[in-house]
């Protein structure tokens, strides 16, 4: 009963989050205009990973997509496959634990598959959740970092009294949806895992039984046979995600510079 | 066709409040920012602020902020702005004007209403 | 607030004539998310209501004539009319459209010569 629980809630946890995961990629809302330095703004900017857009205070909203692939900054670019990835593994993931769910009965389908589905869409949950994670990290991080290069230089000619403020980006609300809803499909995929264990079969300890023949002292000791689960050693060690953390020496200016290449 | 017809001439002491109406007619009225604009005579032109009927969301020019209230009435498709604690510097024509929707400018005016403070 | 200043104040010139103003910002118009100018450009005669010509700097509101053009970026812009008619004499105000208060220009004068 706990298993089928733990399976359930496991699945419901990661639906939430690949549906957030989705939500986040779609959203325009990557990187909003910080008003802090200019909160009378008539004009307000937001960009998403598809595109860039500008909200007039009459209304008026105008979306332009980045029509390009190989003029957008190569960390945009790798944030896009991240969450692409994440998606994709995430989908898959949901695919395999809706027929590995114990409460769907398919055919004469064991529990050893059930279990060895389980444990699948559970790892495919936590690495579409890492991606998701580190997806949305990168661009926080790159936002960071462009955030204090445009303040280095705000006012960009002060002669003549004239001022340029240069726009700068802050976290929008898409980057808040994907950490948390990274976060739920990875705590989702552990508990996929968790629920595997609970649904392998038991082993089977046969006690050993000495059988004293007539004639001679010779006990038989049936060896304890072992369910093969198809999910023992051979998956203990295995290495399931390398973050392998990256420095990025050169910082990229994103967006404004390559929005209409 | 588009039109805003706003209320008659006033007469005002100072320290009394009027209160303007601007009756909007041939489009969407909630769909629209109304700003109000004045110009007192011979001079340029000073921005008021602007209301969005449909969300009552308003933005004030901080040098009105404290006298001028702007209120609409959707049954009536009706902006209204009210100045308080009168002057005679705010002896002017006052404009309301539809927020264009492709852009932050105003495209439709009223006609205009003369607010004359004399004592 | 933004400060628009506009030069010549006023401006004398004859029908035919290719005029020009311009007006100056306190601070860029330039909106780098979508690389606009939020600039804005009225016509007014005397008892009338102010008439928008030019949004986004340099774009023609629908059905204002052709010889009516708005150019220029940042912080200097430019309101021509290539050829004058008798029509065009009245005053001619910029707009701050970027941030709030909303401000407007002096204005410059066009009167027949």
């Known amino acids: 009963m706990a298993v089928t629980a733990c399976q359930g809630l496991g699945f419901v946890v990661s639906l939430i989050g690949i549906a957030g995961i989705i939500a986040a990629t779609c959203m325009d809302q990557w990187s909003t205009q910080d008003l802090y330095n200019n909160p009378v703004t008539a004009v307000f900017n937001y960009q998403g990973l598809w595109r860039s857009c500008v909200r007039e205070s009459s209304g008026f909203t105008e979306c332009r997509g980045y029509f390009t692939l190989l003029g957008l900054p190569a960390m945009l670019q790798a944030v896009r496959a991240l969450m692409i990835v994440g998606i994709v593994l995430g989908a898959i993931g949901l695919l395999v634990s809706i027929f590995a769910l114990k409460c769907i009965r398919i055919g004469s389908m064991e529990d050893s598959a059930k279990a060895n589905m389980t444990l699948t869409s559970g790892i495919m949950f936590i690495v579409s959740g890492l991606c998701a994670i580190a997806g949305v990290s990168v661009f926080a991080n790159m936002l960071v970092t462009n955030f204090w290069m445009s303040t280095a230089n705000m006012y960009t000619g002060m002669g003549g009294m004239v001022q340029t403020v240069q726009t700068r980006y802050t976290f929008g609300a898409a980057l808040f949806v994907g950490w948390v809803a990274g976060g739920l499909t990875l705590i989702g995929g552990v508990m996929m895992c968790i629920a595997c264990r609970g649904l392998a079969p038991e082993e089977t300890n046969y006690k050993a039984v000495s059988y004293h023949a007539s004639g001679h002292s010779v006990a038989y000791k049936p060896g304890g046979f072992k369910a093969s689960t198809g999910f023992g050693s051979n998956t203990k060690n295995k290495k399931i995600y390398d973050g392998g953390a990256r420095t990025e020496d050169e910082v990229q200016s994103y967006p404004s510079k390559h929005d209409y290449v | 066709q588009v039109q805003l017809v706003q209320s008659g001439a006033e007469v005002k002491k100072p320290g009394a409040s009027v209160k303007l109406s601007c009756k909007a007619s041939g489009y969407t009225f909630t769909s629209y920012w109304m700003h109000w604009v004045r110009q007192a005579p011979g001079q340029g032109l000073e921005w008021i602020g602007m209301?969005?009927?449909?969300?009552?969301?308003?933005n004030y020019n901080e040098k009105f902020k404290s006298r001028a209230t702007l209120t609409v009435d959707t049954s009536t498709s009706t902006a209204y702005m009210e100045l308080s604690s009168l002057r005679s510097e705010d002896t002017a024509v006052y404009y309301c004007?539809?927020?264009?929707?492709?852009?932050?400018?105003?495209?439709?005016w009223g006609q205009g209403t003369t607010v004359t403070v004399s004592s | 607030d933004i400060q628009m200043t506009q030069s010549p104040s006023s401006l004398s010139a004859s029908v035919g004539d290719r005029v020009t103003m311009t007006c100056k910002s306190s601070q860029s118009l330039l909106n780098s998310g979508n690389q606009k100018n939020y600039l804005t450009w009225y016509q007014q005669k005397p008892g009338k209501a102010p008439k928008l010509l030019i949004y986004?700097?340099?774009t023609r509101e629908s059905g204002v004539p052709s010889r009516f053009s708005g150019s220029g970026s940042g912080t200097d812009f430019t309101l021509t009319i290539s050829s004058l008619q008798p029509e065009d004499f009245a005053t001619y105000y910029c707009?701050?459209?970027?941030?709030?208060?909303?401000?407007f220009g002096g204005g410059t004068k066009l009167e027949i010569k």
């Open positions: 209301i969005h009927p449909n969300s009552g969301s308003t």
């Open positions: 004007a539809r927020r264009y929707y492709g852009s932050i400018s105003p495209d439709y």
């Open positions: 707009q701050n459209d970027y941030s709030y208060p909303f401000t």
């Open positions: 986004w700097a340099s």
